[in-house]
Protein backbone atom coordinates (compact mmCIF):
# COMPACT_ATOMS: atom_id res chain seq x y z
CA UNK A 1 0.00 0.00 0.00
CA UNK A 2 1.28 3.50 -0.78
CA UNK A 3 2.40 5.66 2.12
CA UNK A 4 -0.27 8.03 3.47
CA UNK A 5 0.68 11.71 3.35
CA UNK A 6 -0.94 15.03 4.15
CA UNK A 7 0.01 18.61 3.35
CA UNK A 8 0.48 21.05 6.21
CA UNK A 9 2.33 24.07 7.49
CA UNK A 10 3.95 24.36 10.91
CA UNK A 11 4.21 27.31 13.27
CA UNK A 12 6.16 27.37 16.50
CA UNK A 13 4.48 28.23 19.80
CA UNK A 14 5.40 31.90 19.29
CA UNK A 15 3.52 31.79 15.98
CA UNK A 16 6.66 32.02 13.87
CA UNK A 17 6.32 30.46 10.42
CA UNK A 18 8.93 28.38 8.63
CA UNK A 19 10.38 29.59 5.33
CA UNK A 20 13.23 28.56 3.05
CA UNK A 21 16.56 30.23 3.69
CA UNK A 22 18.77 29.29 0.77
CA UNK A 23 18.45 25.91 -0.92
CA UNK A 24 19.05 23.65 2.11
CA UNK A 25 17.94 25.53 5.23
CA UNK A 26 14.75 26.60 6.95
CA UNK A 27 14.37 29.64 9.15
CA UNK A 28 11.59 30.78 11.48
CA UNK A 29 10.08 34.26 11.47
CA UNK A 30 6.77 36.06 11.99
CA UNK A 31 4.79 36.47 8.79
CA UNK A 32 1.61 38.41 8.10
CA UNK A 33 -0.78 38.95 5.22
CA UNK A 34 0.50 38.07 1.78
CA UNK A 35 3.90 37.13 3.20
CA UNK A 36 2.25 34.01 4.60
CA UNK A 37 2.55 32.55 1.11
CA UNK A 38 6.31 32.28 1.70
CA UNK A 39 5.90 29.62 4.39
CA UNK A 40 6.92 26.12 3.42
CA UNK A 41 4.26 23.50 2.91
CA UNK A 42 5.29 20.11 4.24
CA UNK A 43 4.20 16.77 2.92
CA UNK A 44 3.97 14.79 6.15
CA UNK A 45 4.16 11.05 5.49
CA UNK A 46 3.11 8.42 8.01
CA UNK A 47 5.92 5.91 8.00
CA UNK A 48 6.96 2.63 9.59
CA UNK A 49 8.12 2.89 13.16
CA UNK A 50 7.22 2.46 16.80
CA UNK A 51 3.79 3.98 17.37
CA UNK A 52 1.63 4.79 20.39
CA UNK A 53 -1.46 6.90 21.07
CA UNK A 54 0.43 10.17 21.32
CA UNK A 55 3.56 9.29 19.30
CA UNK A 56 3.41 8.76 15.54
CA UNK A 57 6.43 8.25 13.24
CA UNK A 58 6.45 10.67 10.33
CA UNK A 59 8.75 11.97 7.61
CA UNK A 60 8.71 15.65 6.71
CA UNK A 61 9.17 16.37 3.05
CA UNK A 62 8.81 19.74 1.36
CA UNK A 63 5.77 19.63 -0.87
CA UNK A 64 6.63 19.18 -4.56
CA UNK A 65 10.34 19.33 -3.78
CA UNK A 66 12.66 16.34 -3.50
CA UNK A 67 13.83 17.51 -0.07
CA UNK A 68 13.28 15.91 3.34
CA UNK A 69 14.30 16.95 6.81
CA UNK A 70 16.90 14.51 8.10
CA UNK A 71 19.02 14.14 11.23
CA UNK A 72 22.68 13.15 10.96
CA UNK A 73 25.86 13.48 12.99
CA UNK A 74 28.01 16.39 11.88
CA UNK A 75 31.22 16.91 13.81
CA UNK A 76 29.83 14.51 16.42
CA UNK A 77 26.68 16.61 16.95
CA UNK A 78 23.13 15.63 15.95
CA UNK A 79 22.22 18.07 13.18
CA UNK A 80 19.07 18.88 11.23
CA UNK A 81 19.47 19.21 7.48
CA UNK A 82 17.43 19.31 4.31
CA UNK A 83 18.45 16.32 2.23
CA UNK A 84 17.71 15.78 -1.44
CA UNK A 85 16.28 12.42 -2.49
CA UNK A 86 15.33 10.68 -5.70
CA UNK A 87 11.63 11.55 -6.17
CA UNK A 88 11.03 8.19 -7.87
CA UNK A 89 11.70 6.43 -4.57
CA UNK A 90 10.20 8.80 -1.98
CA UNK A 91 8.11 8.96 0.07
CA UNK A 92 8.05 5.31 1.09
CA UNK A 93 6.68 3.40 4.04
CA UNK A 94 10.11 2.24 5.21
CA UNK A 95 12.12 5.44 5.43
CA UNK A 96 15.76 5.48 6.45
CA UNK A 97 16.21 6.20 10.17
CA UNK A 98 17.59 9.69 9.68
CA UNK A 99 14.34 10.85 8.04
CA UNK A 100 12.00 9.66 10.80
CA UNK A 101 10.55 11.93 13.47
CA UNK A 102 8.27 10.96 16.31
CA UNK A 103 5.35 13.37 16.15
CA UNK A 104 4.34 13.75 19.79
CA UNK A 105 1.09 15.47 20.73
CA UNK A 106 0.96 17.12 24.17
CA UNK A 107 -1.79 19.58 25.16
CA UNK A 108 -2.71 20.37 21.55
CA UNK A 109 0.91 21.15 20.77
CA UNK A 110 3.24 19.04 18.62
CA UNK A 111 6.84 18.08 19.18
CA UNK A 112 9.00 16.42 16.55
CA UNK A 113 11.59 14.16 18.14
CA UNK A 114 14.31 12.65 15.99
CA UNK A 115 13.89 8.87 15.89
CA UNK A 116 17.62 8.57 15.30
CA UNK A 117 18.57 10.84 18.23
CA UNK A 118 16.09 10.39 21.10
CA UNK A 119 15.47 13.57 23.11
CA UNK A 120 16.59 15.77 20.23
CA UNK A 121 13.82 17.90 18.74
CA UNK A 122 13.12 20.15 15.79
CA UNK A 123 13.64 23.55 17.38
CA UNK A 124 13.48 27.26 16.70
CA UNK A 125 15.17 30.17 18.45
CA UNK A 126 13.39 32.90 20.36
CA UNK A 127 15.05 35.34 18.00
CA UNK A 128 13.56 36.21 14.63
CA UNK A 129 14.93 34.95 11.31
CA UNK A 130 17.14 32.22 12.76
CA UNK A 131 17.67 28.71 11.34
CA UNK A 132 15.45 25.82 12.34
CA UNK A 133 17.72 23.30 14.07
CA UNK A 134 17.90 20.09 16.08
CA UNK A 135 18.00 20.90 19.78
CA UNK A 136 18.85 18.65 22.69
CA UNK A 137 16.87 20.51 25.35
CA UNK A 138 13.17 20.92 26.02
CA UNK A 139 11.63 23.60 28.18
CA UNK A 140 14.61 25.93 27.91
CA UNK A 141 15.11 29.06 25.81
CA UNK A 142 14.63 27.28 22.50
CA UNK A 143 11.18 26.42 21.20
CA UNK A 144 10.22 22.80 20.54
CA UNK A 145 6.41 23.15 20.43
CA UNK A 146 4.54 23.58 17.15
CA UNK A 147 1.04 23.77 15.79
CA UNK A 148 0.04 22.22 12.49
CA UNK A 149 -2.24 23.80 9.89
CA UNK A 150 -3.73 21.50 7.27
CA UNK A 151 -3.37 22.58 3.66
CA UNK A 152 -5.70 21.26 0.97
CA UNK A 153 -3.91 19.37 -1.77
Amino acid sequence: APVRSLNCTLRDSQQKSLVMSGPYELKALHLQGQDMEQQVVFSMSFVQGEESNDKIPVALGLKEKNLYLSCVLKDDKPTLQLESVDPKNYPKKKMEKRFVFNKIEINNKLEFESAQFPNWYISTSQAENMPVFLGGTKGGQDITDFTMQFVSS
Partner: antibody
Protein backbone atom coordinates in the same frame (compact mmCIF):
# COMPACT_ATOMS: atom_id res chain seq x y z
CA UNK B 1 37.28 -3.89 23.38
CA UNK B 2 34.43 -4.57 20.96
CA UNK B 3 34.02 -8.19 19.91
CA UNK B 4 31.50 -9.86 17.62
CA UNK B 5 31.54 -13.65 17.52
CA UNK B 6 29.31 -15.46 15.03
CA UNK B 7 28.18 -19.06 15.36
CA UNK B 8 25.56 -21.40 13.97
CA UNK B 9 26.90 -21.91 10.48
CA UNK B 10 27.23 -25.32 8.90
CA UNK B 11 25.93 -27.63 6.20
CA UNK B 12 22.20 -27.58 5.52
CA UNK B 13 20.08 -29.12 2.78
CA UNK B 14 18.18 -26.98 0.28
CA UNK B 15 14.83 -25.98 1.78
CA UNK B 16 16.23 -26.28 5.29
CA UNK B 17 16.58 -23.71 8.05
CA UNK B 18 19.42 -22.36 10.14
CA UNK B 19 19.75 -19.78 12.91
CA UNK B 20 22.95 -17.77 13.14
CA UNK B 21 24.02 -16.04 16.34
CA UNK B 22 26.34 -13.13 16.97
CA UNK B 23 27.48 -12.64 20.55
CA UNK B 24 28.46 -9.02 21.15
CA UNK B 25 30.77 -7.77 23.90
CA UNK B 26 32.38 -4.44 24.68
CA UNK B 27 29.16 -2.55 23.89
CA UNK B 28 25.40 -2.90 24.38
CA UNK B 29 22.99 -3.65 21.53
CA UNK B 30 20.43 -1.45 23.28
CA UNK B 31 22.59 1.68 23.46
CA UNK B 32 20.85 4.58 21.73
CA UNK B 33 21.97 4.89 18.11
CA UNK B 34 23.46 1.40 17.98
CA UNK B 35 22.93 -0.74 14.92
CA UNK B 36 24.01 -4.28 14.13
CA UNK B 37 23.41 -6.39 11.10
CA UNK B 38 24.48 -9.13 8.74
CA UNK B 39 26.60 -8.96 5.60
CA UNK B 40 27.33 -12.05 3.55
CA UNK B 41 29.94 -13.08 1.03
CA UNK B 42 29.50 -16.01 -1.35
CA UNK B 43 32.70 -17.96 -2.12
CA UNK B 44 34.96 -15.87 -4.37
CA UNK B 45 32.34 -13.10 -4.60
CA UNK B 46 31.77 -9.64 -3.18
CA UNK B 47 29.96 -8.36 -0.10
CA UNK B 48 26.15 -8.24 0.10
CA UNK B 49 24.18 -6.50 2.84
CA UNK B 50 21.52 -8.82 4.27
CA UNK B 51 19.73 -7.24 7.22
CA UNK B 52 20.05 -4.73 10.04
CA UNK B 53 18.42 -3.91 13.36
CA UNK B 54 18.60 -0.66 15.33
CA UNK B 55 18.76 -0.31 19.12
CA UNK B 56 15.00 0.37 19.21
CA UNK B 57 14.07 -2.78 17.29
CA UNK B 58 13.65 -1.11 13.89
CA UNK B 59 14.52 -3.74 11.25
CA UNK B 60 15.64 -3.45 7.63
CA UNK B 61 16.14 -6.18 5.04
CA UNK B 62 17.57 -6.66 1.61
CA UNK B 63 14.33 -6.99 -0.38
CA UNK B 64 15.66 -10.03 -2.22
CA UNK B 65 15.85 -11.93 1.10
CA UNK B 66 13.17 -10.43 3.35
CA UNK B 67 10.56 -13.12 2.98
CA UNK B 68 12.98 -15.88 4.05
CA UNK B 69 15.28 -14.20 6.59
CA UNK B 70 14.37 -12.68 9.96
CA UNK B 71 16.69 -10.62 12.15
CA UNK B 72 16.22 -10.45 15.91
CA UNK B 73 18.18 -9.93 19.11
CA UNK B 74 18.14 -10.73 22.79
CA UNK B 75 19.22 -7.69 24.78
CA UNK B 76 19.64 -9.73 27.97
CA UNK B 77 22.22 -11.90 26.18
CA UNK B 78 23.55 -9.03 24.05
CA UNK B 79 23.19 -11.36 21.08
CA UNK B 80 22.02 -10.85 17.50
CA UNK B 81 20.32 -13.59 15.46
CA UNK B 82 19.50 -14.33 11.86
CA UNK B 83 16.82 -16.93 11.20
CA UNK B 84 17.19 -18.27 7.67
CA UNK B 85 14.40 -20.37 6.15
CA UNK B 86 13.85 -22.06 2.77
CA UNK B 87 17.58 -22.01 2.16
CA UNK B 88 18.91 -22.27 -1.39
CA UNK B 89 22.30 -23.13 -2.87
CA UNK B 90 22.84 -19.43 -3.64
CA UNK B 91 22.65 -18.64 0.10
CA UNK B 92 25.97 -20.43 0.54
CA UNK B 93 28.28 -17.77 1.96
CA UNK B 94 30.29 -16.55 4.89
CA UNK B 95 27.91 -14.51 7.07
CA UNK B 96 29.45 -11.61 8.95
CA UNK B 97 27.98 -9.73 11.87
CA UNK B 98 28.78 -6.00 11.71
CA UNK B 99 28.21 -3.01 13.98
CA UNK B 100 27.53 0.64 13.23
CA UNK B 101 26.27 3.80 14.92
CA UNK B 102 23.56 5.91 13.35
CA UNK B 103 22.29 6.38 9.82
CA UNK B 104 23.89 6.73 7.27
CA UNK B 105 25.78 3.57 8.11
CA UNK B 106 29.39 2.56 8.03
CA UNK B 107 30.43 -0.69 9.64
CA UNK B 108 33.15 -0.09 12.20
CA UNK B 109 33.43 -3.54 13.76
CA UNK B 110 33.04 -6.97 12.16
CA UNK B 111 32.97 -10.54 13.39
CA UNK B 112 35.17 -13.26 11.95
CA UNK B 113 32.26 -14.75 9.98
CA UNK B 114 30.49 -18.10 9.96
CA UNK B 115 30.21 -20.28 6.88
CA UNK B 116 26.81 -21.49 5.73
CA UNK B 117 26.82 -24.22 3.06
CA UNK B 118 23.54 -25.16 1.39
CA UNK B 119 23.94 -28.43 -0.46
CA UNK B 120 22.32 -31.82 -0.80
CA UNK C 1 18.15 -0.09 -5.53
CA UNK C 2 21.30 1.97 -5.96
CA UNK C 3 23.94 0.13 -8.01
CA UNK C 4 27.57 0.75 -7.07
CA UNK C 5 30.16 0.11 -9.79
CA UNK C 6 33.84 -0.03 -8.97
CA UNK C 7 36.64 0.33 -11.44
CA UNK C 8 38.92 -1.26 -12.18
CA UNK C 9 37.87 -4.74 -11.05
CA UNK C 10 41.50 -5.75 -10.73
CA UNK C 11 44.55 -3.57 -10.49
CA UNK C 12 48.22 -4.54 -10.54
CA UNK C 13 50.69 -2.16 -8.94
CA UNK C 14 54.05 -2.00 -7.20
CA UNK C 15 55.12 -0.89 -3.74
CA UNK C 16 55.46 2.89 -3.74
CA UNK C 17 52.88 3.43 -6.50
CA UNK C 18 50.01 5.86 -6.20
CA UNK C 19 46.77 3.95 -6.68
CA UNK C 20 43.28 5.27 -7.40
CA UNK C 21 40.08 3.19 -7.19
CA UNK C 22 36.81 4.63 -8.42
CA UNK C 23 33.28 3.94 -7.24
CA UNK C 24 30.28 5.19 -9.23
CA UNK C 25 26.72 5.24 -7.94
CA UNK C 26 23.68 4.87 -10.19
CA UNK C 27 22.25 8.01 -8.54
CA UNK C 28 23.32 10.80 -6.21
CA UNK C 29 24.31 9.42 -2.81
CA UNK C 30 25.47 12.71 -1.27
CA UNK C 31 28.60 11.89 0.75
CA UNK C 32 27.16 8.72 2.29
CA UNK C 33 29.96 6.47 1.12
CA UNK C 34 32.42 4.28 3.03
CA UNK C 35 35.41 2.18 1.94
CA UNK C 36 36.55 -1.21 3.25
CA UNK C 37 39.68 -3.33 2.86
CA UNK C 38 39.45 -7.12 2.92
CA UNK C 39 42.20 -9.73 2.90
CA UNK C 40 41.59 -13.39 1.99
CA UNK C 41 39.86 -15.33 4.76
CA UNK C 42 39.43 -12.21 6.90
CA UNK C 43 36.57 -9.85 7.71
CA UNK C 44 36.46 -6.44 5.99
CA UNK C 45 37.99 -3.44 7.77
CA UNK C 46 36.64 0.10 7.65
CA UNK C 47 39.05 2.58 6.07
CA UNK C 48 37.02 5.69 5.26
CA UNK C 49 33.51 6.93 6.05
CA UNK C 50 31.46 9.96 4.97
CA UNK C 51 33.47 9.88 1.71
CA UNK C 52 36.66 11.38 3.14
CA UNK C 53 36.92 10.83 6.90
CA UNK C 54 39.74 8.49 7.88
CA UNK C 55 38.76 5.82 10.42
CA UNK C 56 40.92 5.80 13.54
CA UNK C 57 44.11 3.78 13.16
CA UNK C 58 44.04 3.84 9.35
CA UNK C 59 47.32 5.10 7.82
CA UNK C 60 47.21 8.59 6.31
CA UNK C 61 48.32 7.25 2.92
CA UNK C 62 44.64 6.33 2.43
CA UNK C 63 42.31 9.13 1.39
CA UNK C 64 38.85 9.44 -0.06
CA UNK C 65 37.14 12.10 -2.14
CA UNK C 66 34.13 12.73 -4.34
CA UNK C 67 30.48 13.66 -4.01
CA UNK C 68 27.19 13.00 -5.71
CA UNK C 69 27.74 9.86 -7.75
CA UNK C 70 31.50 9.56 -8.28
CA UNK C 71 34.01 8.73 -5.56
CA UNK C 72 37.66 7.75 -5.33
CA UNK C 73 39.87 5.94 -2.87
CA UNK C 74 43.52 6.92 -3.20
CA UNK C 75 46.54 5.16 -1.72
CA UNK C 76 49.35 7.69 -2.01
CA UNK C 77 52.26 5.27 -1.73
CA UNK C 78 51.42 1.60 -1.84
CA UNK C 79 52.81 -0.56 0.98
CA UNK C 80 53.15 -4.37 1.03
CA UNK C 81 50.29 -4.59 3.54
CA UNK C 82 47.89 -2.83 1.12
CA UNK C 83 47.50 -5.70 -1.37
CA UNK C 84 43.88 -6.70 -0.76
CA UNK C 85 40.37 -6.27 -2.13
CA UNK C 86 38.61 -2.93 -1.62
CA UNK C 87 34.87 -2.31 -1.47
CA UNK C 88 32.72 0.80 -1.38
CA UNK C 89 29.34 0.92 0.38
CA UNK C 90 26.53 3.42 -0.12
CA UNK C 91 24.35 4.35 2.87
CA UNK C 92 22.09 6.85 1.14
CA UNK C 93 19.13 4.55 0.57
CA UNK C 94 17.94 1.12 1.63
CA UNK C 95 18.91 -1.47 0.62
CA UNK C 96 22.51 -0.55 1.39
CA UNK C 97 24.68 -1.75 -1.47
CA UNK C 98 28.37 -2.53 -1.98
CA UNK C 99 30.48 -2.17 -5.06
CA UNK C 100 31.63 -5.44 -6.63
CA UNK C 101 35.16 -4.94 -5.30
CA UNK C 102 38.59 -4.04 -6.67
CA UNK C 103 41.36 -6.58 -6.22
CA UNK C 104 44.77 -4.96 -5.83
CA UNK C 105 47.60 -7.33 -6.76
CA UNK C 106 51.39 -7.16 -6.99
CA UNK C 107 52.69 -6.21 -10.44
Amino acid sequence: EVQLVESGGGLVQPGGSLRLSCAASGFSLSTSGMGVGWVRQAPGKGLEWVSHIWWDGDESYNPSLKSRFTISRDNSKNTLYLQMNSLRAEDTAVYYCAKNRYDPPWFVDWGQGTLVTVSS
Amino acid sequence: EIVMTQSPSTLSASVGDRVIITCRASQDISNYLSWYQQKPGKAPKLLIYYTSKLHSGVPSRFSGSGSGAEFTLTISSLQPDDFATYYCLQGKMLPWTFGQGTKLTVL
